[in-house]
């Protein structure tokens, strides 16, 4: 599989309409939870949590702080930590108890605390917590949680130092956690947690298990430096833990290595970054996304791979188990088991099957189970992504966190859609197609540049946004901006699936939120611009240019996939030529203007997709070049002011017939624009125009401003 | 069977270095974390500090940063700790202890005498 | 820190008799129901010997007559028939947070 293309379209910050929260001194919004039933996002930041709309994020509705007192952060600062960061209270745990209450625990000055939020009256009970196990002593420390059935599991480091790790389930019943022992846990890095309901229709009446993903040093081969080995750890719901051997601990408990690197090479992805476990009505069962970057990457590479959740399960109940071996001088530290495997199988939920042996509960299995998961917590087999290969690799990028929502386009494909950040405060979003992937857009969420920390998605219908948190605040941003493709060609050449060309209103608009009959609707997944209506009648830009001056003529092509050629008159451009050169790529320059450079210039894109070429005009502008008599300004217009010797170039613009409502002639000047009233579309297709203005006095023309006919704004 | 064998006595002089060594046996090295705590003479235990001898990671007690530094060599199944800047005040039995599943040391190396003396 | 305190600091018990030592920890060493509390005995010019863990865990090799209780902060180290060989200084240690602590030590000797 290739790198993936770079994302069609970039949008900058100011390009696009995104929502922002952020409030004065206050960092780390990292915690984020919706509540899609009361159309709230939660944030959890550094010493506050607010509540705020979930459809406009820049509302806030609530807010609760949880500081900490003096005389902790004093204790923490003596333990040589720092008073100014590390002593504060990093909220790390947000997560929904009731419809009523939220779970909060905070890193509280390296003395962890948890404690119970109201959320009608959006105050803490009080109950201040030990979040020992639950949270980390360190805000810098990985962490990951989730509430089952009105239980904490969580996966962090258990004390100060940060050297013990845990995965643990608070629980006033049967609290569980991991032994404290390498090959169970080899200083994790914990990325994401998850609940997995057993299906219904579970021929053995199962167990919910509870997923963790982490990547940890690896126990099973030695290297010169520490490898690291991206892990996917299951636990039992029905879990009570051992008798004797294992009490209080788990005896559910088993790890896998997940597979994700490119078959036909050795680049292997070994950091896990971010996991999406998507659930979808058409799906079998759940599959989830893992975001990973190799251990060694200097070049920045990111990788996406996606595994069926019932491959891995397949793993944890059928497949090999490792165990330690002795050997010295060995780089394989852990070999496969290939003794007597103990009944019940150990690290199995107590399931029908199990209980017909009275096995009820896992308080009452065998020593010789017991020891067994205690001695091998590591399986054999690896748990390999959906169609072997990842779904997307990209070079230099470092992605940072990923969600993924199921849509179907117009031809009633489906497509899971990535929307991936990066560590510059970006989003991508992706879609495989076939044995290609296609990143369709790059936004650019956060203006300086900073590392998404938190995504999330909002995929119900009518409200379907991307929020994301950062050190300074968090953005929202809506799955699509269809709008911004202004003709049907940029509409189908994005392959958005959200998006479609509507001829009636002549826009490209969200499919989920259009009214249209998705008959009248325009969208072609492939690519193929030539459904599109012809429309050989554009608008075009007219210029009146001075003798000996200079001319650049835009050309707004948003495609970063597209290669942009001029025409003259119908003849391509050689733009190394000293008469022309190109500005950013993609605007002309033209130098020593004279009567011989009037005429009809033409701006052509040409783009590959697919195994097909598709060319496009993106703009025209129609050129005057005159030796001017000392012109005289119209009365009816006001005089221009030109400051120094800058200079004033009119510019016309002129829809021909079929476009939408003529666009205002603008007058472009050095220190701003006059526009005027635009008049009625003319009936006939002439292009002289039906407007006529006198020149604007030129100073020194040296330079032409101009102006976009289709404002992409 | 497990045990734990612990480099011979020292004598050093103030101000100087010193490095104790503890060869493990009998088990996987690689599995259970290594722990060192000493003894001044008369009196009580103290926790130093620990290693996961898979990663070479080395967490310490506060009271010893910057004193003691714990590393190990995987090929010989072998735990170090190296004490610097020695003064009278080092002069102490130390110990190296495996920490066992249920988070205690279940295993003790014999004990290295080092003193400080000008 | 967790500060151990243990008491007596030494002890004279006749052979056969019972002793008990106490050990008490400035915080609660339970984590969810488990107390992470440890006994060990060291004899002249010997290591420490894991005797309990866990409170009240008999490690394997250890006589029975050697047993542990309580919970939070508060721990009992008991020999319910003193013999001769149990002569020593006995620590208690506590494992729930780090820096790990020990006790000052008790000395028990034979009356």
């Known amino acids: 599989m290739a790198f993936a293309p770079m994302p069609r379209i970039t949008w900058e910050h100011r390009e696009v309409r995104l929502m922002q929260f952020h409030e004065p001194d206050i960092y780390n919004y990292s915690a984020l939870l919706l509540s899609e039933d009361q159309d709230t996002l939660y944030i959890g930041a550094r010493e506050v949590i607010f509540a705020v709309n979930a459809l406009n994020v820049s509302e806030k509705q609530h807010e609760v702080h949880w500081k900490v007192s003096e005389d902790k952060k004093a204790k923490c600062a003596e333990k040589g930590k720092s008073k100014q960061t590390e002593c504060l209270n990093y909220i790390r745990v947000l997560q929904p108890l009731s419809a009523t209450s939220l779970y909060v625990c905070g890193t509280n000055a390296f003395q962890p605390a948890c404690d119970y939020l109201s959320l009608t009256s959006f105050k803490f009970l009080g109950r201040n917590e030990d979040g020992k196990g639950r949270c980390p002593f360190d805000p810098a420390h990985s962490y990951t949680s989730v509430i089952v059935d009105g239980e904490l599991y969580s996966g962090t480091s258990y004390n100060f130092l940060g050297s013990e790790p845990i995965i643990s389930r608070n629980s006033s019943s049967s609290p569980l956690r991991t032994e404290y022992a390498i090959p169970w846990l080899n200083e994790p890095n914990f990325v994401f947690a998850d609940v997995i309901r057993k299906s219904p229709d579970s021929p053995n009446g199962g167990d919910d298990r509870v997923y963790f993903f982490f990547t940890e040093v690896s126990v099973e081969y030695e290297f010169v430096f520490r490898l690291q080995i991206p892990r996917i750890a299951r636990v039992c719901k029905g879990d009570q833990g051992g008798l004797r051997t294992l009490q209080k601990k788990w005896t559910s408990f088993l790890k896998a290595r997940l597979i994700c690197s490119r078959p036909d090479s050795s680049l292997i992805f070994n950091v896990l970054r971010d996991v999406f476990v998507l659930r979808s009505p058409g799906l079998k069962g759940p599959v989830f996304y893992a975001l990973f970057s190799p251990q060694l990457n200097n070049v920045g590479l990111s990788a996406v791979c996606a595994y069926n959740l019932s491959t891995a399960e397949e793993v944890f109940s059928h497949g090999k188990y490792m165990q330690s071996a002795t050997v010295e001088q060995s780089h394989t530290k852990w070999v496969r088991y290939n003794g007597p495997v103990p009944k019940p199988r150990p690290g199995a939920c107590i399931d029908s099957e199990v209980r017909a042996a009275n096995y009820t509960s896992s308080l009452n299995l065998p020593d010789k189970t017991l020891q067994f998961v205690k001695d091998h917590p590591l399986m054999d087999d690896s748990v390999t992504p959906i169609d072997n290969r990842p779904r997307l690799i990209k070079k230099d990028v470092n992605y940072t966190q990923i969600v993924v929502d199921r849509t179907q386009a117009l031809d009633g494909t489906v497509y899971d859609v990535m929307f991936v950040s990066t560590d510059r405060g970006a989003l991508h979003k992706a879609i495989s197609l076939e044995h290609s992937v296609h990143i369709i857009e790059e936004t650019q969420l956060f203006q300086d540049f900073e590392p998404v920390q938190t995504l999330l998605l909002s995929s119900k219908k009518g409200r379907r946004f991307v929020y994301a948190g950062s050190n300074s605040g968090v953005v929202q941003a809506p799955l699509a901006f269809c709008g911004k493709h202004s003709t049907c060609e940029d509409c189908v050449l994005a392959r958005d699936p959200y998006c479609a060309w509507s001829p009636p209103t002549a826009t490209c608009v969200a499919l989920h939120q259009t009214e249209s009959p998705s008959r009248a609707l325009i969208q072609e997944m492939s690519g193929d611009a030539s459904v599109c209506p012809d429309k050989s009648k554009g608008s075009y830009r007219q210029h009146f240019f001075k003798h000996g001056g200079t001319a650049e003529l835009k050309c707004s092509q948003k495609s970063n996939l597209a290669q942009v050629f001029w025409k003259f008159q119908n003849d391509v451009l050689k733009v190394e030529s000293p008469k022309y050169g190109l500005m950013g790529r993609k605007n002309l320059l033209i130098f020593n203007l004279s009567e011989g450079d009037s005429g009809v210039y033409q701006c052509l894109s040409e783009e590959r997709v697919k195994n097909k070429t598709v060319f496009q005009v993106v703009a025209k502008h129609v050129l005057e070049v005159k030796v001017l008599p000392k012109p005289v300004v119209a009365p009816t217009l006001p005089v221009v002011q030109t400051e120094g010797s800058r200079i004033a170039t009119k510019v016309l613009v002129v829809s021909s017939q079929g476009s939408s409502s003529p666009t205002p002639a603008v007058l472009a000047t050095s220190s701003g624009a006059i526009t005027l009233p635009p008049k009625p579309a003319p009936a006939s297709t002439s292009c002289e125009p039906k407007i006529v203005i006198n020149t604007v006095p030129q100073l020194h023309s040296e330079k032409t401003m101009y102006l976009k006919s289709s404002d992409n704004h | 069977q497990v045990q734990l064998v612990q480099s011979g006595a020292e004598v050093k002089k103030p101000g100087s270095s010193v490095k104790v060594s503890c060869k493990a046996s009998?088990?996987?090295?690689?599995?259970?974390?290594m722990h060192w705590v000493r003894q001044a003479p008369g009196q009580g235990l103290e926790w130093m500090g620990q290693?996961?001898?898979?990663?070479?990671?080395?967490s310490y007690n506060q009271k010893f940063k910057g004193k003691a530094t714990i590393t190990v060599d995987k090929s010989t199944s072998t735990a170090y700790m190296e004490l610097s800047s020695l003064r009278s005040e080092d002069t102490a039995v130390y110990y190296c202890?495996?920490?066992?599943?249920?988070?205690?040391?279940?295993?003790w190396g014999q004990g290295t005498t080092v003193t400080v003396s000008s | 820190d967790i500060v151990m305190t243990q008491s007596p600091d030494s002890l004279a018990v006749s052979l056969g008799e019972r002793a008990t030592i106490n050990c008490k920890a400035s915080?609660?060493?339970?984590?969810?129901?488990?107390?992470?509390m440890n006994w060990y005995q060291q004899k002249p010019g010997q290591p420490p010997k894991l005797l309990i863990y866990?409170?009240?865990n008999l490690e394997s090799g250890v006589p029975d007559r050697f047993s542990g209780s309580g919970s939070g902060t508060d721990f009992t180290l008991t020999i319910s028939s003193l013999q001769a060989e149990d002569v020593a200084v006995y620590y208690c240690?506590?494992?729930?947070?780090?820096?790990?602590?020990f006790g000052q030590g008790t000395k028990l000797e034979i009356k």
């Open positions: 915080q609660s060493v339970d984590y969810d129901g488990d107390s992470y």
């Open positions: 202890a495996r920490y066992y599943y249920g988070r205690h040391f279940d295993v």
């Open positions: 866990a409170a009240s």
């Open positions: 240690q506590q494992s729930n947070e780090d820096p790990y602590t």
């Open positions: 009998g088990y996987s090295f690689s599995d259970y974390y």
């Open positions: 290693i996961n001898p898979t990663t070479g990671g080395a």
